[in-house]
């Protein structure tokens, strides 16, 4: 029942362009590129786009012309390396082109940024989008898959595919519309913080494959999909889960059109088999391709089979515990996952994980005891502390999220995350605190049986992006010892981490305080990063500040801008008010 | 606890075909290895077939190529189509199920078994 069309190919390039048509293999083709050479200036890729692309066509002609029979790495690779300013733009990345494939593509895999250098995306007047959109539709959606995908280098690319459709839709909808702003700026609103969620997930799959290997994916997919597929047994599980694997290990090491490709039969397939899998598929299997595979990806768990027997019986009970975790260790225990998770949509994957691994641990060392089933007759019961530690901390930080509101919430995390890694950078501390704090208003509001798979995956997303942009620029062997040892307690790693007794605090700058009378003019959003930096930066001046004093400065910061930003003469203000102000916070800071 | 009971025995002429059904109740055993065994008359019941969880089947080298196993998961269910039958094939016919990855070939390792139904392979 495989099915992944593995027929031999004269021509692997002229079979992708076949299989995903001219308008999706230039597109895929573009994020490749704009992935690998992330400072490549737009024109230049799409010259070289447009080179393959013809290149391509020569080969559907005649499979057996010359270089058709070269690896998509080979031909891509090269086509790279046609690139003059290699050198000059990145450096070391350039000694890849002096290595023979496999060894190539994985040099441009390591070369690859999660923080490139790149300026902030300005979104322009909506007249101006809407012109250009007018006047060169293909270019301004090219621009956009680019832009998304340099800046994004794992974004999970057939799903770039469907927002830029979507991105579309948007402009071809609001661009005739009587208000082309209220009808566009929510769309794209929408699309940009989708993105950046579907970016960061994404992300969190590439990291678990690259740094804890296939096993740990292919634990996280079963785990997942017998939540969402209950009703699918083991066997049709784990070909989905095999299936899955393949799509994701692609398209993370760059192999986009295989991904894409692989992906739409993996969509196929589920499509064709919705009985054995899931009942909550007919409307996603309605929709055309990309939305179709977007609509699968996110679909709702189905039901709980009824009456599902204890798992005691089969997993504790039976004489044939220590055989089959013998005989078959990972497929044993990927059956005890499944059995586990269909039964518990209310856990976190990452919690189902924890207790499998608790369970494999449990059984390596009995099965080799001279009692094995008195050894792990109670192995059921260390779950219980397992399953209660995450309970807990959602229900207290959702109370506490519920008492202060986000951006007050988001605060009391800065000042918790600073606290206990002051050496990571302020942008890095701000961006993930921010985001972590946002996991109350996005799970908060759910009832119990959804609050963990909702809460603790989500922290799973954020605090793998604390990892990723941590590994760039090492500075705490806490946050590389919490993001390196175990995948699933990374979370449990950070929550138990206490104040860095060993930081030497920071020295005062007061350049780092001094404000200007643009922050008058930032929106909402970019005024609480503002204060949210100095946040961070008065924590790592003075660690030990209680609570209660963070508190009062940053009443009086606030006061500070509302003040300024309603005087006269703002810049005057900012600058009197602002000594002010800096001499009264280092006072009550005792700094 | 699995309850497991065969239907589908009967007489048949040599060259002829059956097919056997075991129907389990008590618990899905989708992820259970299931087997047939039988038993000739004054002789030690023997394994026949065996199916795991990812329905890849092992065989007697006496029924190789005459009998096919299969299950139905769905209706928690296991077959045996028995063609070109022999009179040696004569005897009464045990569904056997278990909790095991590896589908076993040995009776000691099942834990669960059917009544039996008699096949009797006669001109």
């Known amino acids: 029942r495989g099915v992944f069309r593995r027929d031999a190919h004269k021509s692997e390039v002229a079979h992708r362009f076949k299989d995903l048509g001219e308008e999706n293999f230039k597109a895929l083709v573009l994020i490749a590129f704009a992935q690998y050479l992330q400072q490549c200036p737009f024109e230049d890729h799409v010259k070289l786009v447009n080179e393959v692309t013809e290149f391509a066509k020569t080969c559907v002609a005649d499979e057996s012309a010359e270089n058709c029979d070269k690896s998509l790495h080979t031909l891509f690779g090269d086509k790279l390396c046609t690139v003059a300013t290699l050198r000059e733009t990145y450096g070391e990345m350039a000694d890849c082109c002096a290595k023979q494939e496999p060894e190539r593509n994985e040099c441009f895999l390591q070369h690859k940024d999660d923080n490139p250098n790149l300026p902030r995306l300005v979104r322009p007047e909506v007249d101006v989008m809407c012109t250009a959109f007018h006047d060169n539709e293909e270019t301004f959606l090219k621009k956009y898959l680019y832009e998304i995908a340099r800046r994004h280098p794992y974004f999970y690319a057939p799903e770039l595919l469907f927002f830029a459709k979507r991105y579309k839709a948007a402009f071809t909808e609001c661009c005739q519309a009587a208000d082309k702003a209220a009808c566009l700026l929510p769309k794209l609103d929408e699309l940009r913080d989708e993105g950046k969620a579907s970016s960061a997930k994404q992300r969190l799959k590439c990291a678990s494959l690259q740094k804890f290997g296939e096993r740990a994916f292919k634990a996280w997919a079963v785990a997942r999909l017998s939540q969402r597929f209950p009703k699918a047994e083991f066997a049709e599980v784990s070909k989905l889960v095999t299936d899955l694997t393949k799509v994701h290990t692609e398209c993370c090491h760059g192999d986009l059109l295989e991904c894409a490709d692989d992906r739409a039969d993996l969509a196929k397939y589920i499509c064709e088999n919705q009985d054995s899998i899931s009942s909550k598929l007919k409307e996603c299997c309605e929709k055309p391709l990309l939305e179709k595979s977007h609509c699968i990806a996110e679909v709702e768990n189905d039901e709980m089979p009824a009456d599902l027997p204890s798992l005691a019986a089969d997993f504790v009970e039976s004489k044939d515990v220590c055989k089959n975790y013998a005989e078959a260790k990972d497929v044993f225990l990927g059956m005890f996952l499944y059995e586990y998770a269909r039964r518990h949509p209310d856990y976190s994957v990452v919690l189902l994980l924890r207790l499998a691994k608790t369970y494999e641990t449990t059984l390596e060392k009995c099965c080799a005891a001279a009692d094995p089933h008195e050894c792990y007759a109670k192995v059921f019961d260390e779950f219980k502390p397992l399953v209660e530690e995450p309970q807990n901390l959602i229900k207290q930080n959702c109370e506490l999220f519920e008492q202060l509101g986000e951006y007050k919430f988001q605060n009391a995390l800065l000042v918790r995350y600073t606290k206990k890694v002051p050496q990571v950078s302020t942008p890095t501390l701000v961006e993930v605190s921010r985001n972590l704090g946002k996991v109350g208003s996005k799970c908060c509001k759910h009832p119990e049986a959804k609050r963990m798979p909702c809460a603790e995956d989500y922290l799973s997303v954020v605090l793998n992006q604390l990892c990723v942009l941590h590994e760039k620029t090492p500075v705490s062997d806490r946050v590389t010892k919490c993001c390196t040892e175990s995948l699933v307690n990374r979370r449990p790693c950070f929550s138990a981490l206490e104040v860095d007794e060993t930081y030497v605090p920071k020295e005062f700058n007061a350049e780092t305080f001094t404000f200007h009378a643009d922050i008058c003019t930032l929106s909402e959003k970019e005024r609480q990063i503002k204060k949210q930096t100095a946040l961070v930066e008065l924590v790592k001046h003075k660690p030990k500040a209680t609570k209660e004093q963070l508190k009062a400065v940053m009443d009086d910061f606030a006061a500070f801008v509302e003040k300024c930003c309603k005087a006269d003469d703002k810049e005057t203000c900012f600058a009197e008010e602002g000594k002010k102000l800096v001499a009264a916070s280092q006072a009550a800071l005792g700094l | 606890e699995v309850q497991l009971v065969e239907s589908g025995g009967g007489l048949v002429k040599p060259g002829g075909s059956l097919r056997l059904s075991c129907a389990a109740s008590g618990r899905p055993v989708s992820n259970y290895a299931a087997a047939w065994f039988r038993q000739a008359p004054g002789k030690e019941r023997e394994f026949v077939s065996a199916i795991n969880w990812q329905k890849t089947a092992t065989y007697a080298d006496s029924v190789k190529g005459r009998f096919t196993i299969s299950r139905d998961n769905a209706k928690n269910s296991l077959y045996l189509q028995m063609n070109s039958l022999r009179a040696e094939d004569t005897a009464v016919y045990y569904c056997?199920?278990?909790?095991?990855?590896?589908?076993?070939?040995?009776?000691?390792?099942?834990?669960?078994w059917g009544q039996g139904t008699l096949v009797t392979v006669s001109s």
């Open positions: 056997a199920a278990v909790f095991r990855v590896v589908a076993p070939k040995t009776q000691y390792d099942y834990d669960y």
